[in-house]
């Protein structure tokens, strides 16, 4: 199509930029004629460093185009995002970040893991993209439940823990109180609601220490709480139903051999917490001598029959209810138990299939006489709260 404008001059023939093409191609371009530039896949339109989605030039009356020719520049995805607790390797070549370049993310071995294979390609849209089409970099999730502990130990009736036995064990210190918790992610601590209830509005006054065996060790890793989440079904001073809380930490802690989360129970874990199955609980609470333990102590204790436990406490403390949200543990003969100062700590079990330790219970309440015969320790049954835990963690 030719417009015959005698007063106007034709525009110079446009030459397509390298890796680009022009449309429409005409023998002559006169006033108001236009052309567009299209780039090959993997190349983008740039005017200098300004990205353009499209380019159209119009021929003007004076015989010049209204804008200069852009470039078709190879897509550059830029340096990939850093991976906390991991690293990135350039597969195509050192620092090559252009179209079809390949990078490989990997996590620090032993203590972190990623769900994908970590391979990303620089795609035509300018984003590093995984084989599943994900544009965000992978996440190095902390490994959970690895321990050097083996069952067979005898808190009350307990014995001292060794380094790496309970790397999830957390010491919670108030001005005048002490309790425990269990690390369940690199920035979340699981504990008992009653242990942190008074601190719920003043979370920052709670001093959190981890990576220690000795209660008074100066070589601890300090963590500070950002927020405390008490289960909405917990009523302070009116029994211990829903005695569970989460503490969000201000910063993620670095996972290593002495600081590691405990796993949460899988759906199948209920079968590992039946009557007479053995769990392990650790703490710095009162020992047989009635003093707070200096060293982290642990005890292996069997799960007690729920009906027996309910009956014992109905007799012992009428009005105190052992609910379906609780599990009991201890020996009928007594001698092994958790005690004051252990509250909030984890009762853990070994998952034979994964060979990882998971938290089955949270030290909650029991008889005033820790370790007394026929008087079991009562623990919050964590498996009942997995949806609650997951909901809090995903929303906050």
């Amino acid at each position: 199509h030719h417009h015959h404008h005698h007063a106007s001059r034709p525009c110079p023939d446009p030459t397509a930029p390298p890796n680009g093409s022009i449309s429409p191609v005409q023998a002559i371009y006169v006033l108001k004629d236009r052309f567009s530039v299209f780039c090959k896949t993997g190349f983008e339109l740039l005017q200098g460093s300004v990205p353009l989605k499209s380019f159209t030039a119009v021929c003007q009356k004076d015989g010049s185009w209204d804008r200069p020719m852009p470039e078709c520049s190879i897509i550059d995805c830029g340096p990939p995002d850093d991976l906390p607790n991991g690293h990135v390797d350039y597969i195509t070549g050192p620092e090559v970040t252009t179209y079809k370049a390949v990078i490989q993310y990997s996590c620090e071995e032993t203590f972190y893991t990623m769900s994908s294979n970590g391979k990303y390609v620089c795609e035509a849209d300018g984003f590093w993209t995984s084989s599943k089409g994900e544009k965000l970099p992978p996440v190095c999730e902390p490994v959970c439940g690895l321990s050097t502990h083996t069952i067979g130990g005898r808190i009350v009736g307990g014995q001292p823990a060794k380094p790496g036995d309970f790397p999830w064990q957390v010491l919670l210190l108030g001005q005048t109180t002490a309790a425990a918790g269990a690390l369940i992610h690199d920035n979340w601590v699981l504990t008992a609601a009653h242990a942190v209830y008074e601190k719920r509005m003043a979370a920052s006054s709670l001093n959190i220490r981890m990576g220690i065996l000795k209660r008074l060790s100066p070589h601890y890793t300090q963590a500070w709480p950002e927020e405390i989440f008490i289960h909405e079904g917990y009523t302070h001073g009116a029994g211990f139903d829903n005695d569970i809380a989460l503490i969000k930490l201000k910063n993620k802690v670095t996972i290593n051999g002495s600081i590691m989360p405990v796993c949460l129970p899988r759906k199948e874990a209920a079968s590992l917490m039946r009557t007479d199955f053995t769990g392990t609980v650790a703490g710095w609470g009162l020992t047989q001598k009635g003093l707070l333990a200096r060293n982290l102590m642990f005890v292996d204790i069997p799960i007690a029959d729920h009906q027996k436990c309910t009956a014992v406490y109905e007799k012992l403390y009428p009005g105190v209810r052992v609910s379906a949200n609780m599990l009991c543990a201890g020996l009928e003969t007594g001698g092994k138990d958790s005690c004051r100062g252990d509250a909030g700590g984890a009762l853990v079990f070994l998952d034979n299939e994964t060979q990882r330790w998971f938290v089955g219970g949270i030290v909650s309440w029991g008889s005033i006489n820790c370790g007394a015969a026929d008087q079991y320790g009562v623990y919050t049954k964590v498996i009942n709260y997995i949806p609650w835990i997951e909901n809090i963690i995903s929303n906050f």
Epitope: Q47, G48, V50, P51, K53, P68, G126
Partner: antibody
Amino acid sequence: DVQLQESGPGLVKPSQSLSLTCTVTGYSITSDYAWNWIRQFPGNKLEWMGYISYSGRTSYNPSLKSRISITRDTSKNQFFLQLNSVTTEDTATYYCAKLGGGHGMDYWGQGTSVTVSS
Amino acid sequence: IVMTQSQKFMSTSVGDRVSVTCKASQNVDTNVAWYQQKPGQSPKALIYSASYRYSGVPDRFTGSGSGTDFTLTISNVQSEDLAEYFCLQYNSYLTFGSGTKLELK
């Protein structure tokens, strides 16, 4: 007509984060171009901070790269600036602007003054 | 890339012809724009790609140059042209010049 409007707090404390929003009307930020944040210091020196392109890709001034993040919400036709660990040196008038290198007019917001002070 | 506007101020009279210059620290091709800013206002784009005038910009404003040396010329200066002028390179990232203020003699 294309219009850009900045919004956000006028006062930020040192070491905190500065967060600003640019609301665009009259043109979709996914249609084309680069959507920029530019600031002007007392004394009128202009500094380009970074942009988010129509495709969602970002480019940042190398001098700010460790502290800056530009994101967008395409459903609201807004783009955002977050500048971390601010100091008194970050006191300036902050503009959002559509810069196209001559492809379509350049449009600027009216600017929002931000003071960093304790 | 540093864009140097060596003259902070330039004095002129209405009807004069004035040239504002800008020097790039390295080759920026023709990827340069010029902006005008009046007190209390946002910058307004005048020129793109070194020499192309935005629509609506009076033809007394002319841009020229390529590589490292660029000039904005205002022929027949009007009182409304008294403002600060900035150059911008967009060849590699984006950098502004420090500005040149046009004032009456």
